[in-house]
Structures are given as structure tokens and as C-alpha cells.
């Protein structure tokens, strides 16, 4: 005959929880609860998550799996890791692109879009930090180029060109008048 309820489950091993009348063992990650156990300390009936769904944790109550997220092509996202029964799709940016968060307080679950990385070479600058979690950090002008305004300008190839002070210092020319 049924005994009295205990606030905790007196079952051997961990991960038992009272579901209805009985303390039941939960379902492992990647499985959903089809039916609770039908006897004390019993195993629940658990089924594997169908394709394109997942459950990342052991659970007692999920009667369906969560739908895998689709990476947002409009935001230039790609799947870095495909969805499995135990983990959601991991979306990110393809090589040469970086994550630009769409909210100020950025966390791993925040919405984002992918931006093409700055090509320091095309700007005639040294690459100081490679692009990954943030945009490329470009450094000083490459040899044969000098700082002029916001950009790098090629050293003159003849004495006919004007070579301001900064040019002369970098390019080895004396200032021409």
C-alpha cells in the first residue's frame, strides 16, 4: 500500500523527482519525457529528440524538445556547429567577418550580425590585431607609405612630387619647394 510522501525522493542514485504519485528518474539530455515512471523510483519513458530539435540538460518535465535555431542569413550568419540532440546550432560569422552586436550590453545570446573585417593591407597599414570577435585593428602605414589625414599615402617616386615633413621623415625625401 502507498506510503506517505517525503519532501525529497528516497531513491538510490541522483536525479529523481516526484512526478505525480512517484519519484521518477529524469530523462537524459537529448531526450524528452514521453511518460513519467509508473512505480516508485522508476525510470520515466524517454524518447530521443526528433531531428532539428534538442534538449541540452537532463530534465523531468520537458514533454517536447526545443526547436533548433536557424542562423540568420540576412545578418550574414553561418552555422559554426550544427544542431544535435543535446545542443542548439551555434551561429557565428565566416572567416574574414566579425560579430557586431545589436544591443549595447552584449552577451552570448544577444542578437548579432556579421560585418566584413577591415582589410588593413588594402588601407596600406600593418595589421595590429587580427579580426575575430571584433574588427581588425590596423596599425601604422606600411613601408613606402606615410600618414596623411586619415589615410596612408604612397611615397612619391620622383622629386617632382611634393613631400611634406611627415613624408620626408618616412620616405627619406627632403621637403621640396
Amino acid at each position: 500500500q502507498g506510503g506517505t510522501r517525503s519532501p525529497r525522493c528516497d531513491c538510490a542514485g541522483d536525479f529523481h523527482k516526484k512526478i505525480g504519485l512517484f519519484c521518477c528518474r529524469g530523462c537524459p539530455a537529448g531526450h524528452y519525457l514521453k511518460a513519467p515512471c509508473t512505480e516508485p523510483c522508476g525510470n520515466s519513458t524517454c524518447l530521443v529528440c526528433p531531428q532539428d530539435t534538442f534538449l541540452a540538460w537532463e530534465n523531468h518535465h520537458n514533454s517536447e524538445c526545443a526547436r533548433c535555431q536557424a542562423c540568420d542569413e540576412q545578418a550574414s550568419q553561418v552555422a559554426l556547429e550544427n544542431c544535435s540532440a543535446v545542443a542548439d546550432t551555434r551561429c557565428g560569422c565566416k572567416p574574414g567577418w566579425f560579430v557586431e552586436c545589436q544591443v549595447s550590453q552584449c552577451v552570448s545570446s544577444s542578437p548579432f550580425y556579421c560585418q566584413p573585417c577591415l582589410d588593413c593591407g588594402a588601407l596600406h597599414r600593418h595589421t595590429r590585431l587580427l579580426c575575430s570577435r571584433r574588427d581588425t585593428d590596423c596599425g601604422t602605414c606600411l613601408p613606402g607609405f606615410y600618414e596623411h589625414g586619415d589615410g596612408c599615402v604612397s611615397c612619391p617616386t620622383s622629386t617632382l612630387g611634393s613631400c611634406p615633413e611627415r613624408c620626408a621623415a618616412v620616405c627619406g625625401w627632403r621637403q621640396m619647394f
Epitope: 516526484k18 511518460a35 509508473t38 512505480e39 519513458t45
Partner: antibody
């Protein structure tokens, strides 16, 4: 669609026996605990017995213990209630129901009348 | 055995009224409580489990609340088809026990 259909009810004299059946369909019968609940005419609901999915665990209300036996045949998707030493107070509609706590699905019931 | 005391045993209300039924357990049953609706000549139908979880397909005008020993069942706006007898049931401890029922009528 989940369906539970009781049968085997009828009239019987006090001290007599009766065997009720419940045919289940539309779900994996072998995964669920099953119950019999009864309702005397004009009265409330009374849970009387439960059986685990494998049939290894059974529980009874004091009012029927020693007289009634619950059993199941998972190969036939069937639940049974063997009722012996019947009394006038056992007169009721008998329902089978699925679940190990909340009774999610019920049959339509079968009437058992115990009278001399 | 856990005794479930339901009140009122009967009540009369008008269409559109808010209707409340209470159920009290003789000992703490956490939230292991269900509510059923039974129409004349029919089997009971599960409306709410775990004190407040509405079953799939049950209209949202039905709701449940409470934990421990005191529970409430509410119909926010009574409809003609809600005329029935309502039962609470505990499944915290065997034997499973029901309240005596509340018969709901239209004024």
C-alpha cells in the same frame, strides 16, 4: 486518438464475482500506469486501484483490498478488474483511466449493479 | 488518508459571472492537485493538473491556483456549457482521494 472502452458490467448478486475489461488504443499502453475509479449512483468519484506499466506494482483502496484484483495484458492493450465477494455498496459505474496522478484519459464507464 | 474538502457543494450563477470553488486538503499536498469537470452521464474530464496547469484544449476561462492545503478553481466568465459537477483530486499520496464535488447550475 486515445480511447479507453470498458466492458463486463452487469447485475450480480451479493457475494458474486464479475470481471471488468478496459480495451486501450491510440497510445503506447505499456508505458502508462492505469487505474479503476468508480462512482456510485448520484455520488462522487472514488479511486479504487492502480497498476504500474509493467504490472509489477499494484495499489488498492481499503474498501476493495482483498476482494478486487487489478491486472493488465500489455500484449493485448487490456486492463482488467476481477471483483469477488461483491457487496451492495460496490454498485457503481466503473471507469478505467490512464495516468499516475492526474487522470488524463477516461473510458465511458460500465455499470455494475449488486443486488439480490 | 488525505481528506479533500470542497466548497460549496452546489452553486447557482449567471452566464458571464466569475465562479470560484475551493478545495482544502487535510495535510500538505504541495501542488499535486487536479480539477475535473463531469457532465451528466459522461466520464470526468481533466481540466487542470499540478494545481494550476491548464490541460491542452481547455478554454482559458478556467484557472487554478494554490499550494500546500488550500486551492482555488475559477471560471472567469461562466458559459452555458460549463454546467457540470467539478471535482478536485489529490495525487500526492496513495490512496488518491477526491473532493465530494461542486454542482454548478445556471440561475
Amino acid at each position: 486518438e486515445v480511447q479507453l472502452v470498458e466492458s463486463g458490467g452487469g447485475s450480480v448478486q451479493p457475494g458474486g464475482s464479475l470481471r471488468l475489461s478496459c480495451a486501450a488504443s491510440g497510445f503506447t499502453f505499456s508505458s502508462y500506469g492505469m487505474n479503476w475509479i468508480r462512482q456510485a449512483p448520484g455520488k462522487g468519484l472514488e479511486w479504487i486501484t492502480y497498476i504500474s506499466s509493467s504490472g509489477g506494482h499494484t495499489y488498492y483502496a481499503d474498501s476493495v483490498k482483498g476482494r478486487f484484483t487489478i491486472s493488465r495484458d500489455n500484449a493485448k492493450n487490456s486492463l482488467y478488474l476481477q471483483m469477488n465477494s461483491l457487496r451492495a455498496e460496490d454498485t457503481a459505474v466503473y471507469y478505467c483511466a490512464r495516468g499516475q496522478g492526474p487522470f488524463e484519459y477516461w473510458g465511458q464507464g460500465t455499470l455494475v449493479t449488486v443486488s439480490s | 488518508d488525505i481528506v479533500m474538502t470542497q466548497s460549496p457543494s452546489s452553486l447557482s450563477a449567471s452566464v458571464g459571472d466569475r465562479v470560484t470553488i475551493t478545495c482544502q486538503a487535510s495535510q500538505d499536498i504541495t501542488n499535486y492537485l487536479s480539477w475535473y469537470q463531469q457532465k451528466p452521464g459522461k466520464a470526468p474530464k481533466l481540466l487542470i493538473n499540478d494545481a494550476s496547469n491548464l490541460e491542452t484544449g481547455v478554454p482559458s476561462r478556467f484557472s487554478g491556483s494554490g499550494s500546500g492545503t488550500d486551492f482555488t478553481f475559477t471560471i472567469s466568465s461562466l458559459q452555458p456549457e460549463d454546467i457540470a459537477t467539478y471535482y478536485c483530486q489529490q495525487y500526492d499520496t496513495l490512496p488518491i482521494t477526491f473532493g465530494q464535488g461542486t454542482r454548478l447550475e445556471i440561475k
